[in-house]
């Protein structure tokens, strides 16, 4: 049978040839009557076998951490007969481990963050070295952490790279610390091998600094023009922490000013100085008042750290501006009658300087040849007004310093101009009508209607009359429907066209206003034959078409 | 018996390239691993490179890497040196030498009588 | 790379005499030296393996000894044959590396 040992080869051997042991048959006597062979993975290329010996030889560098354990035949011949002496067999060489590999931190980069102020033995983080080296085989594989830069803030637990708080830190002196740990294999042996990994360790912010003022005193200053929320300025607190640590409120004590208001700007954390009131020079010139910031997320656990708040007194001047006329109402409305001779008086509007100075007021009516002012804001009129060509004037006056003539004001004056019955009603259009040559008596010929162009405080009622001859004239009548119309109808039976063919019938149209203003209008009346139907609208017809040149039968 | 009978040698200029042979017989040339050694005239000798029988492992001096590249075609029994980039310290004979069996597989017990190459210009 | 030192660098001995050639390696290399013969215009020949095996063929009167860093090669008696330049070679390290020579030439 086979006789061998189990085969051991040294991994990362530097010779050429490394002679691992010896595989032979009993029956060998030693005459180099037999020959070895090796067959199967790596045989002829990372093993071979003494074919007379049957030793066999590693002939490369072997890597455990690559590969463990080779399987391989072996095979023996007797050479006279070329038969196998001993049946081919399966055998193993394992690849035993040396400390060729250092631990290495596998996850880096390492980063952990830890909130400043954490008590002694808060966890940070764990690191985590892997050793390729055979774990079974001594101590080859086995670790031990070190701090080599990091004390006194930290420490690290030898056999499971915990790393931990050692000592309070304080985020404001210093952010973040680089600490480095070594792990060494062989339990920190002679002969050990060692990787070294850096941590990152950020401190967070804890809320343990309150914002104050830098400066206990802020100048500023108002212009007395400025409108209601008005930035007039900024004021600005320090906190040493950072990000919502750091974001504060300002605000102002409550006895203080109603006329400033302070809001916080939460991008810069700067408060602005608001102006919540008009403020006016000639009432008062300086303002003072005492402004306090507070952080915006205090834990209670912390309050410890913001008892009193930090205060800062600001000082407000108003700045006097030369300011425009002001006049006493915000626009004036002011009535006058039509048909007022030139020189009427209109009205009066006022208007002064609101400075210490006091400056005389000039005034005048933009774009109005209608209307005078003169200095003492006195409106009259300049020409004779007619209601029926514009009832309201649309103006505007302006206020003038005589010391300043830039400082102006305006305002809008509104002139309504009053009716006086000055126009007579009229025909509501031109009115031209027919009557036929066989109309009877009491036809209606025409609907008529009035106009009138002044303006009736009541409504307009019109009276409708005709003429004293065309009274005594019988051939046609009035009806004055009480409704502002009237119709005209035949007096007679029958017209004759050849006789008289047209008539012009005078209607007198009264109004209702005082006094009361009557027109005489014109009615024209053609007679036409219309043929047996009789009808107007037939008459009308044919006059139209006989109007139009056409001849009909 | 075993033979070893080399070829490809001659006059080149510098930085030039050849390719030199070694045609073997009387042995299971795929069973041995093969070398090629230079001398250098009147110098000692100086090992080349080395391949192992199935060529799979190869080895060259410090003084050739990279330049010199030794192969093997077993089915020839034939050992290669293609040597490139040659400088005049290049200049020897160069013979190729088999290797031994067991723990002398890196050894050489049979030598050719060697190819001459000189590099000049 | 192991440095291999041979002396003397020439011996001079007459035939029949006893030639005795020293090999020094750098650093240890076990038993794993070899020794070659060369004669003018003639490739290396084997001679010892393994320190002190002999090669097929070669005759008793030559003998190798020696381990670790350092060898020898004996010639009991030399024959007129014998007088040849002799190298030393370590093949237990990459690169393998030969020695200076000894040349052993007639007194």
């Known amino acids: 049978g086979w006789v061998w040992n189990q085969f051991f080869v040294p991994e990362e051997m530097n010779t050429t040839s490394h002679h691992i042991g010896q595989l032979r048959s009993d029956l060998d006597n030693g005459n180099n009557s037999f020959q070895y062979k090796l067959l199967g993975a790596g045989a002829g290329s990372t093993f071979i076998i003494d074919e007379r010996t049957g030793d066999i030889y590693a002939i490369q560098k072997l890597d455990r951490e690559e590969r463990s354990l080779y399987i391989l035949r072996a095979q023996v011949i007797d050479i006279a007969t070329g038969r196998a002496v001993e049946p081919e067999s399966e055998f193993v060489i394992k690849v035993s481990d040396i400390n060729d590999n250092e631990p290495k931190f596998l996850d880096e980069p390492y980063e952990a963050i830890v909130p400043e102020m954490s008590p002694e033995g808060t966890l940070v983080i764990q690191v985590t070295a892997s050793d390729a080296d055979d774990p079974s085989s001594g101590n080859n594989a086995r670790l031990l952490y070190s701090l080599l830069q990091g004390q006194p803030y930290f420490s690290v637990e030898p056999t499971t790279g915990v790393i931990r708080i050692s000592s309070k830190m304080d985020r404001e002196l210093q952010d973040e610390y680089w600490v480095i740990i070594q792990a060494k294999d062989m339990i920190g042996q002679p002969g050990a091998l060692s990787g070294t990994t850096s941590v990152l360790i950020k401190l967070s912010d804890v809320n343990d600094n309150k914002p104050i003022f830098k400066e206990s005193l802020y100048r500023l200053t108002v212009s007395e023009s400025a409108p209601t929320g008005t930035s007039i300025g900024t004021i600005m607190a320090y906190d040493n922490d950072i990000g919502e640590n750091a974001e504060m409120d300002y605000s102002i004590e409550e006895d203080d000013s109603q006329t400033f208001d302070i809001i916080t700007n939460h991008e810069t954390q700067e408060g602005i100085v608001i102006l919540k009131k008009k403020v006016d020079f000639e009432h008062q010139n300086h303002y003072g008042i005492r402004a306090k910031v507070k952080n915006h997320h205090v834990p209670e656990q912390l309050m410890k750290y913001h008892t009193e708040a930090s205060t800062t007194f600001i000082k407000i001047q108003v700045e006097d501006v030369d300011e425009p006329p002001l006049f006493l109402l915000p626009y004036y409305v002011f009535e006058v009658f039509e048909e007022t001779p030139q020189g009427s008086f209109v009205g009066v509007v006022s208007a002064t300087d609101p400075d210490n100075r006091k400056s005389p007021i000039r005034y005048s009516i933009t774009r109005s040849k209608v209307f005078n002012i003169n200095d003492n804001g006195t409106i009259t009129t300049s020409n004779s007004l007619d209601r029926e060509i514009s009832a309201w004037y649309n103006l505007s006056i302006t206020a003038t310093e005589k010391y300043n003539i830039e400082q102006i004001s305006s305002i809008p004056l509104y002139v309504q101009v009053l009716n006086i019955n000055d126009h007579a009603p009229e025909f509501s259009q031109y009115y031209e009508t027919y009557v036929c040559e066989n109309a009877g008596s009491g036809q209606v010929i025409q609907t008529i209607s009035a106009v009138d162009r002044d303006e009736s405080i009541e409504e307009h009622h019109f009276y409708f009359n005709l003429s004293v001859e065309d009274t005594n004239n019988s051939s046609f009548t009035i009806i004055d429907n009480q409704d502002n119309t009237a119709v005209i109808l035949t007096n007679r039976t029958g017209f004759n066209l050849q006789e008289e063919p047209v008539f012009y019938i005078s209607i007198l149209i009264a109004d209702n206003g005082i006094p009361s203003l009557t027109s005489t209008n014109t009615l024209t009346i053609h007679v036409c034959d219309c043929g047996d139907s009789g009808s107007t609208q037939t008459c009308q017809y044919q006059e139209l078409v006989l109007s139009m040149g056409f001849k009909t039968e | 018996q075993v033979q070893l009978l080399e070829s490809g040698g001659g006059l080149v200029q510098p930085g030039g390239s050849l390719r030199l042979s070694c045609a073997a017989s009387?042995?299971?040339?795929?069973?041995?691993?093969m070398n090629w050694v230079r001398q250098a005239p009147g110098k000692g000798l100086e090992w080349v490179s080395t391949i192992s029988g199935g060529g799979a492992n190869t080895y060259y001096a410090e003084s050739v890497k990279g330049r010199f590249t030794i192969s093997r075609d077993n089915s020839k029994s034939t050992l290669y040196l293609q040597m490139n980039s040659l400088r005049a310290e290049d200049t020897a004979v160069y013979h190729c030498?088999?290797?031994?069996?067991?723990?002398?597989?890196?050894?050489?017990?049979?030598w050719g009588q060697g190819t001459t190459v000189t590099v000049s210009s | 790379e192991i440095v291999m030192t041979q002396s003397p660098v020439t011996l001079s001995l007459s035939l029949g005499e006893r030639a005795t050639l020293s090999c020094r390696a750098s650093q240890s290399i076990s038993s794993n030296l070899a020794w070659f013969q060369q004669k003018p215009g003639q490739a290396p020949r084997l001679l010892i393996y393994g320190a002190f095996t002999r090669a097929t063929g070669i005759p008793a009167r030559f003998s190798g000894s020696g381990s670790g860093t350092e060898f020898t090669l004996t010639i009991s008696s030399l024959e007129p044959e014998d007088f040849a330049v002799y190298y030393c070679q370590q093949y237990n390290y990459w690169p393998l590396t030969f020695g200076g020579g000894t040349k052993v030439e007639i007194k």
């Open positions: 009387g042995f299971t040339f795929s069973s041995y691993a």
């Open positions: 030498a088999k290797g031994g069996m067991g723990g002398y597989y890196y050894g050489m017990d049979v």
